[in-house]
């Protein structure tokens, strides 16, 4: 018994292809690359039909439907543009992922181009089916400093030139320390900012001495100390991590990390600082910023900054030797022999940064830690040296420049 001639589906084929088909002959229907067999609304790779005793086919010929990769996955801090008209998502369609510039940049400078594969998944030549990653751009403020003459005793910072600075504030709005934004969800600050002052008679760190995440908040995009800023973002604290080798008596490894409950929106007034790429050279100029006390023991109205040179380690050690204070390898000193320019109470944890002129990028050198009074002659400001603890910071945060 002969069955009727078969027509292959559009974009498909039948095998074996014969002039005549008889009882018990079987044919396999398959589709071209990028198409799937569709039978009764079910997609499959192939479909088999058989010539029956009564000269009819066991089933109708199915259709071939173009593979659809469907809507591509959303990219955090990124956008999708369709290269094909009508935003097609079918086989061989192309899309391009890009990051929200200028605040995010694609990891490894990936092209971001994905093509809809025959398997129905968006594929990139390098990343395969994995989505690209948009990393925060660090150390490139939208507003650049007017080239400064040397600052004396500090000066008000220009708004937006220090977008990485964070204010650590009690819930009542009272600021108590500074910090710097790293990546999109971490603040680096001084470990001594996260516990109450210790009793000199028994300087051990107890559970009760530590600030709990619910005790304080982080404010980014801040310029005024107490007045509200239109650009400020208030963020809750998820977790705090003090350096495991921190010593509250000597301020050794005086660095801590604060994990934010949610990521801030990066913009012209909120941007992370870059981690140092190498050691800091003695004599290099650095900028220290904060809302700490000024020389008349008054707090400023706005963010202040000073420009000072890095001081040789042995010079700094000698300066503090008479006070029996150790300047260890995890510390870096800055300031001028004659004094007058220094960080002070309330600046703790805040950033000391330097400009890499070749790249035009700002890097974190240190965080404000300790000193003998403020701006004293022959005494330098001592900062926690970020380069020394960069490995630890990267271990905890996963942040890379």
């Amino acid at each position: 018994n002969e069955c009727p001639e078969l027509q292959p589906p559009v974009h498909g084929k039948i095998e074996p292809s014969q002039a005549k088909y008889f009882f018990k002959d079987q044919v396999l229907v398959s589709c071209d690359t990028g198409y799937k067999v569709l039978k009764d609304n079910v997609e499959m790779d192939t479909f088999q039909i058989e010539c029956l005793k009564d000269g009819t086919w066991s089933n109708k010929i199915p259709t071939c439907k173009i593979v659809d990769c469907r809507a591509p996955g959303e990219l955090e801090h990124g956008l999708i543009t369709f290269s094909t008209r009508n935003n097609l998502t079918t086989y061989k369609s192309e899309i391009k992922y890009s990051c929200q510039e200028p605040y995010y940049k694609m990891l490894n400078n990936n092209t971001g181009i994905y093509t809809c594969s025959a398997q129905g998944v968006w594929m990139n030549k390098v990343l395969g089916r994995s989505l690209p990653t948009c990393l925060p751009v660090c150390g490139l403020p939208k507003f650049s400093r007017k080239l400064m003459a040397r600052i004396f005793n500090g000066r008000p910072a220009q708004k937006g030139t220090t977008p990485w600075i964070a204010m650590l504030s009690h819930l009542n709005g009272q600021p108590f320390c500074g910090g710097s934004l790293l990546g999109s969800s971490w603040i680096v600050t001084a470990a001594h900012c996260l516990h109450q002052s210790l009793d000199p008679e028994d300087p051990t760190l107890r559970d009760s001495d530590l600030l709990s995440p619910s005790d304080f908040k982080i404010i980014l995009g801040k310029h005024w100390r107490l007045r509200s800023d239109e650009n400020e973002q208030h963020l809750g604290v998820k977790h705090t991590t003090l350096h495991p080798q921190y010593d509250p008596n000597t301020f050794e490894n005086d660095v801590a990390l604060v994990e934010l409950l949610e990521s801030p929106v990066l913009n012209a007034f909120v941007m992370p600082i870059c981690l140092p790429e190498g050691p800091q050279q003695e004599g290099a100029m650095v900028i220290v910023s904060g809302w700490g006390k000024q020389f008349l023991q008054r707090f400023p109205e706005t963010l202040m900054e000073i420009e000072i040179p890095i001081v040789d380690h042995s010079t700094c050690q000698k300066a503090y030797a008479p006070l029996k204070k150790k300047v260890t390898r995890d510390m870096i000193c800055a300031g001028e022999k004659e004094g007058g320019k220094d960080a002070c109470a309330g600046d703790s944890g805040g950033p000391m940064v330097t400009l890499n002129r070749e790249r035009g990028q700002w890097y974190l050198v240190g965080t404000v830690s300790w000193g003998d009074d403020c701006g004293k002659k022959d005494r330098y400001g001592v900062y926690s040296y970020i380069h020394h603890n960069k490995d630890w910071i990267q271990r905890v945060t996963g942040v890379r420049n």
């Epitope: 760190l205 495991p244 080798q245 390898r329 490995d391 630890w392 905890v396």
Partner: antibody
């Protein structure tokens, strides 16, 4: 590498000092832990000495042990050993809180 | 001080199997937890730090994870050489500075 020495049989109350020496890195700029392990028991952290020389002890170890350092050694003094102090004592380099390099240990037996 | 409570010993599994050891911290310590392996007569060896980061040179059959204050060490595709006691260690600085490092009680893994 690190190596401990000075472990021996002592009578209760006789002070004993254990010494840790290092090769391949400088002890003067290292952070060093002392950990002990009683026979058939678990690890017990005793204390740590920082690069600056400051020391921190486990609450149970305060007053019973003293950690000190020279430019080439880190010492652990058991001030007044009791039979409970019988253990293998390890010296281990501290790497941001973890002990990444351990010595083979030295056995201290306290018995009358 | 932070107390670490580990899975009771011994834990037994066949060659080629998988074993998971748990370590419960008495308070939040973030990811400041390490895992060590100690074979009889040897000093401990650091396997994992930061709750889940494998130390360079350690087999990828070892993996660590964290869920709140509960930490896990999983050893897959077990080999006879994995027979050892495994310890977790906290290095989170929140407790009194006396106890800057603490170990769990250890979990012995036996291979059938």
């Amino acid at each position: 590498s690190v190596e401990e020495s000075g472990g021996r049989l002592v009578t209760p109350g006789t002070p004993l000092t254990l010494t840790c020496t290092a090769s391949g890195f400088s002890l003067s700029s290292a952070y060093m832990n002392w950990v002990r392990q009683a026979p058939g028991k678990g690890l017990e952290w005793i204390g740590i000495i920082y690069a600056s020389g400051s020391t921190w002890y486990a609450s149970w170890a305060k007053g019973r042990f003293t950690i000190s350092k020279t430019s080439t050694t880190v010492d652990l003094k058991i001030t007044s050993p009791t039979t409970e102090d019988t253990a293998t004592y390890f010296c281990a380099r501290d790497d941001y809180g973890t002990a990444d390099l351990w010595g083979p240990g030295t056995l201290v037996t306290v018995s009358s | 001080a932070v107390v670490l409570t580990q899975t009771a010993s011994p834990v037994s599994a066949p060659v080629g199997g998988t074993v998971t050891i748990k370590c419960q911290a008495s308070q939040s310590i973030g990811s400041s937890l390490a895992w060590y392996q100690q074979k009889p007569g040897q000093s401990p060896k650091l396997l994992i730090y930061g709750a889940s980061t494998l130390v360079s040179g350690v087999s990828s059959r070892f993996s660590g994870s964290r869920s709140g204050t509960e930490f896990s060490l999983t050893i897959s595709d077990l080999e006879c050489a994995d027979a050892a006691t495994y310890y977790c260690q906290n290095y989170y600085l929140s407790s009194s500075s006396a106890d800057r490092r603490t170990f769990g009680g250890g979990t012995k893994v036996e291979i059938k």
